[in-house]
Interface confidence: medium
């Protein structure tokens, strides 16, 4: 069966300066390929986190994605700013040249509240 990307929260609210967790789990690790988080959709979407060796300031993975059986690809955004507001999508790719997007979560909207 086709892999599903599940983002159970429709939205989260976080105060500026605090941290928030955006949850994402997969039903399978197959087909082989990376998982990436984006803010927004379409051509203008912004890469927020990739479960690879890249370093993303303020964004970390919640559980150890290097473990073979791990299906949790949640992220934590620290020191949230008003500019972090938007809808975040957890996206599964199939490895290739280039990688192909095969499934996206339903999106989680982040609301940033004034401190």
């Amino acid at each position: 069966t086709e892999v599903k990307v599940i983002q159970p929260e429709k939205s989260v609210s976080v105060a500026a300066g605090d941290s928030t967790v955006l949850n994402c789990t997969l039903t399978s690790l197959l087909p082989v390929g990376p998982i990436r988080w984006y803010r927004g959709v379409g051509q203008s979407r912004q890469l927020i986190y990739s479960f690879t060796t890249e370093h993303f300031p303020r964004v970390t993975n919640v559980s150890d994605a290097t473990k073979r059986s791990n299906l949790d690809f949640s992220i934590r955004i620290s020191n949230v700013t008003p500019e972090d507001a938007g809808t975040y999508y957890c996206v599964k790719f199939q490895r290739g040249s280039p990688d192909t997007e095969i499934q996206s979560g339903g999106g989680t909207e982040v609301y940033v509240l004034a401190k």
């Epitope: 983002q7 159970p8 429709k10």
Partner: antibody, heavy 119, light 108 residues
């Protein structure tokens, strides 16, 4: 107080159409995703359809896909369900249900409207 | 699609007794599970969300527990108004949203 009032139910023949309405009050209607859930006589609850607050995102149960159309008019605080090509198995009480703002559970329901499809 | 199985189908008890209702999911839904009460001629009512959080105005004799695939709704001491049908619903997976088949709690 949140209120959801369904209307438009009735008795129709197989193949005919019906449009259900749900008038909402007591909350900012356009900010919430809305659903239709039905219950056939003597049966359990069955989710039918979902529409996002803006109307941009829509889902249907496989059993009604291609026959039912969900819509909303945020200026009138009203949710609709257009039901075409009705079948006997669509006979049920149809409930309008408001979703929680963060998760897809239903924090308020209407009393329902009965749709009977019979020849 | 996540299938929810409720048991028993019917629970026959006396007022003051403890009711234990079960809901089993075909795959993990973590704690993304809600319970509803339905009475004839009334709108269904949200009782529990997040597997264990009581909705506003719900008496504390109602409690929910469980995570993953096994969930329980407990009514500590049945009152006359608690005799009704109870449904669980998962909201972990994106639509289709699924309900259990229901458990009827009836008076002995």
């Amino acid at each position: 107080d949140v209120q959801l009032v369904e209307s438009g139910g009735g008795v129709v023949r197989p193949g005919e159409s019906l449009r259900l309405s749900c008038a909402a009050s007591g909350f900012t209607f356009s900010s919430y995703d809305m659903n239709w859930v039905r219950q056939a006589p003597g049966e359990g609850l069955e989710w039918v359809s979902l529409i996002s607050g803006s109307g941009e995102i829509i889902y249907y149960a496989d059993s009604v896909k291609g026959r039912f159309t969900i819509s909303r008019d945020n200026s009138k605080n009203t949710l609709y369900l257009q039901m075409n090509s009705l079948r006997a198995e669509d006979t049920a009480v149809y409930y309008c249900a408001k979703e929680n703002n963060r998760y897809r559970f239903f924090d308020y329901w209407g009393l329902g409207t009965l749709v009977t499809v019979s020849s | 699609e996540t299938v929810l199985t409720q048991s028993p189908g019917t629970l026959t008890l006396s007022p003051g007794e403890r009711a234990t209702l079960s809901c089993r999911a075909s795959q993990s839904v973590y704690t993304y599970l809600a319970w509803y009460q339905e009475k004839p001629g009334q709108a269904p009512r949200l009782l529990i969300y997040g597997a264990s959080s009581r909705a506003t105005g719900v008496p504390d004799r109602f409690s929910g527990s469980g995570s993953g695939t096994e969930f329980t709704l407990t009514i500590s001491s049945l009152q006359s108004e608690d005799f009704a049908v109870y449904y669980c619903q998962q909201y972990y997976d994106r639509p289709p949203l699924t309900f259990g088949g229901g458990t009827k709690v009836e008076i002995k």
